[in-house]
Amino acid sequence: MAERAALEELVKLQGERVRGLKQQKASAELIEEEVAKLLKLKAQLGPDESKQKFVLKTPKGTRDYSPRQMAVREKVFDVIIRCFKRHGAEVIDTPVFELKETLMGKYGEDSKLIYDLKDQGGELLSLRYDLTVPFARYLAMNKLTNIKRYHIAKVYRRDNPAMTRGRYREFYQCDFDIAGNFDPMIPDAECLKIMCEILSSLQIGDFLVKVNDRRILDGMFAICGVSDSKFRTICSSVDKLDKVSWEEVKNEMVGEKGLAPEVADRIGDYVQQHGGVSLVEQLLQDPKLSQNKQALEGLGDLKLLFEYLTLFGIDDKISFDLSLARGLDYYTGVIYEAVLLQTPAQAGEEPLGVGSVAAGGRYDGLVGMFDPKGRKVPCVGLSIGVERIFSIVEQRLEALEEKIRTTETQVLVASAQKKLLEERLKLVSELWDAGIKAELLYKKNPKLLNQLQYCEEAGIPLVAIIGEQELKDGVIKLRSVTSREEVDVRREDLVEEIKRRTGQPLCIC
């Protein structure tokens, strides 16, 4: 008993130690070691029968998908995949875990959010953080210089998620990327077109795509007096401007990141600007910015991009925003992020963003990081933030109290009398063999009312009713669940009649 009390005390102390280290923002390695110790102590403690039983739940930042949620998810995926295929993309898949080395040094300050796996026989492994780095590894490994691909899969981040806003530790990403040497801004414009097509098709509300360029950011930082070593960390501060005020961002840059106040003010003059192609033109005339080679290249490309976006008919959805500084280290050129807009409280106010639903950019150097000779494969891509979209679609359907079908069953094989199980089994098998989505109730003698009720609840449109008289006459009674009208259909015509009524092609091609 004393032993257990001692262990409980140590578990408590170790828990406090871990919390303290997290609050102090101690190194990831130290926190990881102390968490491992805590888990070992807890394991030795074992279950305590006197304590409350094990709480059955999914791990923090994860969730189960109910049939209803899965139906929503499949509809969303269907819209996205159709769009990706319409644009000529192939599909690939990669392992859910990568060698830790593959992911290291690719995400900047976000690296601390990577999930490391416990040692599995020598290889240090991590769960993938996104689909882009594995894609770059795939290109380098297979010596590919040209591909247009999409990849839909789960990724993992040790974030502290606000799940109510559609943020998780395990979540899907839907990525589309174009790899290869092409003329400037054509693939980039297509990525933005795809983003707009998908967000419009999903009908989740009005959206805006913010566009910037890493080279413009870097050039701007250089002329404002930010040292090279601080570029990335200042980037991550600037990127918060969509969530907090300039004052807060400035305080962070000056107070926490050691930037001189006058340098921060110079940055502020730039990053608080947003507009369209006219802002690009204006900055091309900026006496300081136009003298910076990187910024000039970026501005030139953005001018060209806006031309293509106009031809694609989406320029009204795009805003050049100098505060967009996506956190990932691998971006080298154009970067973009789509945000949903809330309706402004009063007319004349700026539209308010409610979080990113898609993002992407150009990353010309990432593949080269994996190539022994450093050979670069230019890439540009986008990622759809489907978890947030699922949340929005679910909320919208709940508000509309819309019934969602969770199965695709076209017909229920039913019987009106007892002792017809064998006939039901024969008929349902015929229907399955003909490619009809059919079900039957798993009871020998179900009541007709129960069978009809099941159809109502499951949204099954048709019932094929077998009766003794129908068997003698060689017909099946086909009943429409909603209109309740019944017709006798010859057994040999039943498949064709069901397909006709449910709008299914007459052959399984």
Epitope: E9, L10, E33, K40, L41
Partner: antibody, heavy 120, light 107 residues
């Protein structure tokens, strides 16, 4: 019963090297963090280094960092301390010890110690 | 590094006496403290861990208390085999440090 037996101590010249071993028995060696602690003649105790059961975590006192390397062989139930560039002030009895409750940095079982003398 | 200071550095007592040894930490260490007993030419022996938990097999006359920066080891009734040097050790953060020791001698 738990037993820890150190070996490998002896007389060595400054700048020389020595490898200490600690043979463990009577417990599941791979479950436990292990540590080396030393005691200079007539002095107090000094924590030198530790290693986790899975080899993943190690640490060293500043006074030995870069010169000493801790390692273990779980198959042989053995703990090691490779000591290079030895100095006079490394002269001490070196004890290996097991962490209490596998992971708590307190030695619940200690070896009898092995004497390392660094002298020209 | 966290400094551990023991007092007194030596104490003389008789069999049956109650003895208290104090250990102070240079910063708060919660209850991450252990007490050891060491006899000449022998390895230290763990008495108390987590400031007040008695290691199995250690007589109940030994007890520990305290948390934060101030800790005590108490021997309620000294026995002949208790004459030795006692060390405290913090297990809060690496490098884990020991007190300089308190020598308990026969009066």
């Amino acid at each position: 019963q738990v037993q820890l037996v150190e070996s490998g101590g002896g007389l060595v010249k400054p700048g020389g090297s020595l490898r200490l071993s600690c043979a463990a028995s009577g417990f599941t060696f791979s479950d436990y963090y292990m540590t080396w602690i030393r005691q200079a003649p007539g002095k107090g105790l000094e924590w030198v280094s530790y290693i986790s059961g899975s080899f993943r975590y190690t640490n060293y006192a500043d006074s030995v960092k870069g010169r000493f390397t801790i390692s273990r062989d779980n198959a042989k139930n053995s703990l090691y301390l490779q000591m290079n560039s030895l100095r006079d002030e490394d002269t001490a009895v070196y004890f290996c010890a097991r962490y209490v409750y596998q992971v708590v940095a307190i030695g619940d079982y200690w070896g009898q110690g092995t004497l390392v003398t660094v002298s020209s | 590094d966290i400094q551990m200071t023991q007092s007194p550095s030596s104490v003389s007592a008789s069999v049956g006496d109650r003895v208290t040894i104090t250990c102070r930490a240079s910063q708060g260490i919660s209850s991450w403290l252990a007490w050891y007993q060491q006899k000449p030419g022998r390895a230290p022996k763990l008495l108390i861990f987590a400031a007040s938990s008695l290691q199995s097999g250690v007589p109940s006359r030994f007890s520990g208390s305290g948390s934060g920066t101030h800790f005590t080891l108490t021997i309620s009734s000294l026995q002949p085999e208790d004459f030795a040097t006692y060390y405290c050790q913090q297990a809060k953060s690496f490098p884990y440090t020991f007190g300089q020791g308190t020598k308990l001698e026969i009066k």
